[in-house]
Interface confidence: low
């Protein structure tokens, strides 16, 4: 079951998924000037058996027409239900060091992939929050959010992390403001 909405936004914080539950989909997005090959899958799917999880399908991008006007591949309507944008940074991913039953690691990059990764999370997925650079944790509650199914609807649990800068008033829970532009979580996925 796909999660219906995005993980919560926390002021001055970003989230990352360090491993992806089976059933997670990753759109095969290509950078400008490239498109998904016609015979290629529109997404990768985390699948597995009792002992091993891995990504089915491979994303492949090919050069667009000579005029180079093709935009990035647009997900099909069914793919747009849950769009998760994450920054691709380096290949030194935290997920590469994590092994969790029933979860896939961060898929390796593919040639000419887009700079953002769009994930479709499933119920049971956990994402972890960190304060962006220059901000500190003021309140130290659980710093993760889990997509749960409640009364037939999906919802993300509310993380209890509050990040504050030393020179500004403290933010209080529920006070939302435009997210700070982060450097990004240390070599991992970053919310947009």
């Amino acid at each position: 079951e796909l999660c219906d909405d995005d993980p919560p936004k926390i002021t001055h914080a970003t989230f990352k998924a360090v491993a992806y539950k089976e059933g997670t989909m990753l759109n095969c997005e290509c950078k400008r000037g490239f498109r998904r090959i016609k015979s290629g899958s529109p997404y990768m799917l985390c699948t597995g058996n009792s002992s091993h999880s891995s990504w089915d399908n491979q994303c492949q991008c090919t050069s667009s027409a000579a005029r180079n006007t093709t935009k990035q591949v647009t997900p099909q309507p069914e793919e747009q239900k849950e769009r998760k944008t994450t920054e691709m940074q380096s290949q030194m991913q935290l997920a590469d060091q994590v092994s969790l039953p029933g979860h896939c690691r961060e898929p390796p990059p593919w040639e000419n992939e887009a700079t953002e990764r769009i994930y479709h999370f499933v119920v049971g997925q956990t994402v972890y929050y960190q304060c962006v650079q220059g901000y500190r944790a003021l309140h130290r509650g659980p710093a993760e959010s889990v997509c749960k199914m409640t009364h037939g609807k999906t919802r993300w649990t509310q993380p209890q992390l509050i990040c504050t800068g030393e020179t500004e008033p403290s933010q209080f829970p529920g006070e939302e403001e435009p997210q700070a532009s982060p450097d990004g979580l240390p070599e991992s996925e970053t919310s947009r």
Epitope: V18, A19, S90, M92, Q93, L94, Q97, V98, L100, T126, Y128, Y129, Q130, C131, Q133, G134, Y135, R136, A137, R140, G141, P142, A143, E144, V146, Q160, L161, C163, D183, P186, E187, S188
Partner: antibody, heavy 117, light 107 residues
């Protein structure tokens, strides 16, 4: 007041096992990102393992498959189970709290592990 | 892995001196850098995070600067309690790595 107190270190033969404990007070271990960092005269400070609040764990290449990080929420305690110990694992082991930005804002006093025959 | 190199490895100074310790990262880490102070037989203590932000409770004579690959820890006027070993740490990418340390000794 935040406090971390390690125990369980000692002298062990190569191939042996030890379990280190880190008792926390002043905050809840299960809600935080916790780490074990070791220090040797030769290699300096090295992040050995960490555990995220949701249970995700990670290990340095040098200990993966031999060490296991865990916690007991009811005791508010962090553990490091060390198996198949080698001479190069000899170090002072610290538990440390991550401040949610990969900086370590509180450390225990450390416990010495000596692996020698 | 990102290597962190500190210089000098040791430095001698007197009370009241201004001391500068440098740390270089093998690749750019923006300002994902911390400085720690460690005294013999004690655990490291966080002084500076995010390259230049002072940890709560740390005296203002400590300051940090730099971005990218080159960073500096400055103690504006050395006090007797500042003689210790100082470490830098990058928090940009896993595995998190530390510098080899700079020992600050009394001249």
């Amino acid at each position: 007041e935040v406090q971390l107190v390690e125990s369980g270190g000692g002298l062990v033969q190569p191939g042996g096992s030890l379990r280190l404990s880190c008792a926390a007070s002043g905050f809840t271990v299960s809600s935080n990102y916790m780490s074990w960092v070791r220090q040797t005269p030769g290699k300096g400070l090295e992040l050995v393992s960490f555990i995220y609040s949701g249970g995700i764990t990670s290990y340095a290449d040098s200990v993966r498959g031999r060490f296991t990080i865990s916690r007991d929420n009811s005791k508010n305690t962090l553990y490091l189970q060390m198996n198949s110990l080698r001479a190069e694992d000899t170090a002072v082991y610290y538990c440390a709290r991550d401040d949610y930005s990969n900086y370590f804002d509180y450390w225990g006093q450390g416990t010495l592990v000596t692996v020698s025959s | 892995d990102i290597q962190m190199t500190q210089s000098p490895s040791s430095v001698s100074a007197s009370v009241g001196d201004r001391v500068t310790i440098t740390c270089r990262a093998s690749q750019g880490i923006s300002n994902w850098l911390a400085w720690y102070q460690q005294k013999p037989g004690k655990a490291p203590k966080l002084l500076i995070f995010a390259a230049s932000s002072l940890q709560s409770g740390v005296p203002s004579r400590f300051s940090g600067s730099g971005s990218g690959t080159d960073f500096t820890l400055t103690i504006s006027s050395l006090q007797p309690e500042d003689f210790a070993t100082y470490y830098c740490q990058q928090a940009k990418s896993f595995p998190i790595t530390f510098g080899q340390g700079t020992r600050l000794e009394i001249k």
